[in-house]
Interface confidence: low
């Protein structure tokens, strides 16, 4: 149910493109294509190409994206396009000028002097933005989200965007300055991963990050399963970067117990993050005993 045909406008197309990109990434990383038939991979790649081509129709002259061409461009959506295209670049041919143009727009047009990224064109499909939807601590969570996207695009865009390292550092400094006052476990997790990507998730931030986990295994807000899966996935990625393999098993066990395999309304971020995190876990911890995922992928019928 994760491999779907992308369709619709600038936001809906990304909602449709997300699960296919992350499913292929997951199956590639974990070398599980035999289970589903290696020929399915090519079909999935065709769907990703289709989503990529369709998304270009919503690229504005500034290289930013919005749901429709007559709407103001969205910081969050543009960062998300950067994130998905960066991952897809390992799978299909992505024009680096398209990807890095979006990166340049984020830095030059949307980053304030204090490092914060601002949103002037909120997405219409609020269900696609995951835990960021809760307006509390939005400056930090948006800045962390964009920072993560910039880091993921760094290998491809560093040569084309001179200001990229400086922008990343500025955003990181803002997150560092705000981190100890964060209240939401979601923000602690996403911002923690952003800091970990910069090798800055150390004391006192590390203590805050670890102490925010409920029972040492989840970054949880009441009655928010999708946000909690998303947040805990960010946290798992941070723990893996830290090589804190003592703290990893209970987190993986919790994610596994959720039996959450993506898909469904409002699941875009949870789907993307849980499969990114579990793929990374299975790569970094080859002798994994904590994961027994019964994942099923279905290709759409023609």
């Amino acid at each position: 149910h994760l491999i779907v045909t992308p369709a619709g406008a600038g936001e809906q197309n990304m909602i449709g493109m997300t699960p296919t990109v992350i499913a292929v990434h997951y199956l590639d990383q974990t070398e599980q294509w035999e289970k589903f038939g290696i020929e399915k991979r090519q079909e999935a790649l065709e769907l990703i190409k289709k989503g990529y081509t369709q998304q270009l129709a919503f690229k504005q002259p500034s290289s930013a994206y919005a749901a429709f061409n007559n709407r103001p461009p969205s910081t969050w959506l543009t960062a998300y396009v950067v994130k998905v295209f960066s991952l897809a670049a390992n799978l299909i041919a992505i024009d680096s000028h398209v990807l890095c143009g979006a990166v340049k727009w984020l830095i030059l047009e949307k980053q304030k002097p204090d490092g914060v990224f601002q949103e002037d064109g909120p997405v219409i499909h609020q269900e696609m933005i995951g835990g960021f939807r809760n307006a509390k601590e939005a400056d930090v969570s948006l800045t962390a989200f964009v920072l993560i996207a910039l880091q993921e695009a760094r290998d491809i865009c560093e040569g084309q965007v001179n200001s990229l390292p400086g922008s990343i550092n500025k955003a990181g400094e803002y997150i560092e300055a705000s981190y100890m006052n964060l209240q939401r476990p979601y923000t602690v997790a996403i911002a923690g991963y952003a800091l970990a990507l910069m090798n800055k998730l150390e004391e006192p931030y590390l203590g805050k990050f670890l102490n925010t986990a409920k029972d040492r295994n989840r970054w949880e807000e009441p009655d928010q399963q999708l946000y909690n899966v998303e947040a805990t996935s960010y946290a798992l990625l941070a723990l893996l970067l830290l090589k804190d393999f003592d703290s990893v098993p209970p987190v993986v066990r919790w994610l596994n117990e959720q039996r959450y395999y993506g898909g469904g309304y409002g699941s875009t971020q949870a789907t993307f993050m849980v499969f990114q995190a579990l793929a990374q876990y299975q790569t970094d911890v080859p002798d994994h005993k904590d994961l027994n995922m019964d994942v099923s992928f279905h290709l759409p019928s023609r």
């Epitope: 203590g207 670890l210 102490n211 029972d215 040492r216 295994n217 003592d246 703290s247 098993p249 209970p250």
Partner: antibody, heavy 120, light 108 residues
């Protein structure tokens, strides 16, 4: 920074009892607080702790019978129900070493303890 | 609950000597372990938190090490005032936490 426990006394089995930990020199709105007990001549036993927002966490054996709650920014109560002779001990409260989880950052300083004796 | 097995239950050392106390957890607790010192008639005192971080005001002769399931407290250059009982407190989660049985240190 100092802490003091109060409320310890001789009670009969089954009698509920509330102990209070009063802190001075800092506020519980930014610090955590833990409870530990020690039976006469025995080792230490962890009971639970409360965070700065008032959420309490308990050792699995203490769940249901013990309740930790914040009475004010300077006092925390430990309510004990269904007491038996096995609960005879000195009860200590201790501040989290920082505002974080005292099981991660340790507990320091400690109060002098208050003795609870359960006897028929 | 995690079981924390402290060894030895009692040990002695001459002034200036070295004492090593081990604490073994029955399950992986990462670095969630602290060491406490308790003298008769007194409350415990925090020595080490997060397995190896020295608490404020604690002399540097106290050293904590280890992670996962094996932890060690080493007192190098033992002083008379170090005569006490030492406890480890390990934590797998907020509800799964326990003290070790204690190690009595006698200084000769």
């Amino acid at each position: 920074q100092s802490l003091e426990e109060s409320g310890g006394r001789l009670v009969t089995p089954g009698t509920p009892l509330t102990l209070t930990c009063t802190v001075s020199g800092f506020s519980l709105s930014t610090y955590t607080l833990g409870w530990v007990r020690q039976a006469p001549g025995k080792g230490l036993e962890y009971i639970g702790w409360i965070d700065s927002s008032g959420s309490a966490y308990y050792a699995s054996w203490a769940k249901g019978r013990f309740t930790i709650s914040k009475a004010s920014s300077t006092t925390v109560d430990l309510k004990m129900a269904g007491l038996t002779t096995e609960d005879t001990a000195t009860y200590f409260c201790a501040s989290g070493n920082t505002g974080g989880d005292p099981l991660y950052y340790g507990m320091d300083p400690w109060g002098p303890g208050t003795l609870v004796t359960v006897s028929s | 609950d995690p079981v924390l097995t402290q060894t030895p239950s009692s040990t002695s050392a001459a002034v200036g000597g070295t004492v090593t106390i081990k604490c073994q957890a029955s399950q992986n607790i990462g670095r969630w372990l602290a060491w406490y010192q308790q003298k008769p008639g007194q409350p415990p005192k925090l020595l080490i938190y997060r397995a190896s971080d020295l608490a404020s005001g604690v002399p540097s002769r106290f050293k904590g090490s280890g992670s996962g399931t094996q932890f060690t407290l080493t007192i190098s250059g033992v002083q008379r005032e170090d005569a006490a009982t030492y406890y480890c407190l390990g934590s797998y989660s907020s509800s799964d936490s326990a003290f070790g049985g204690g190690t009595e240190v006698v200084v000769k």
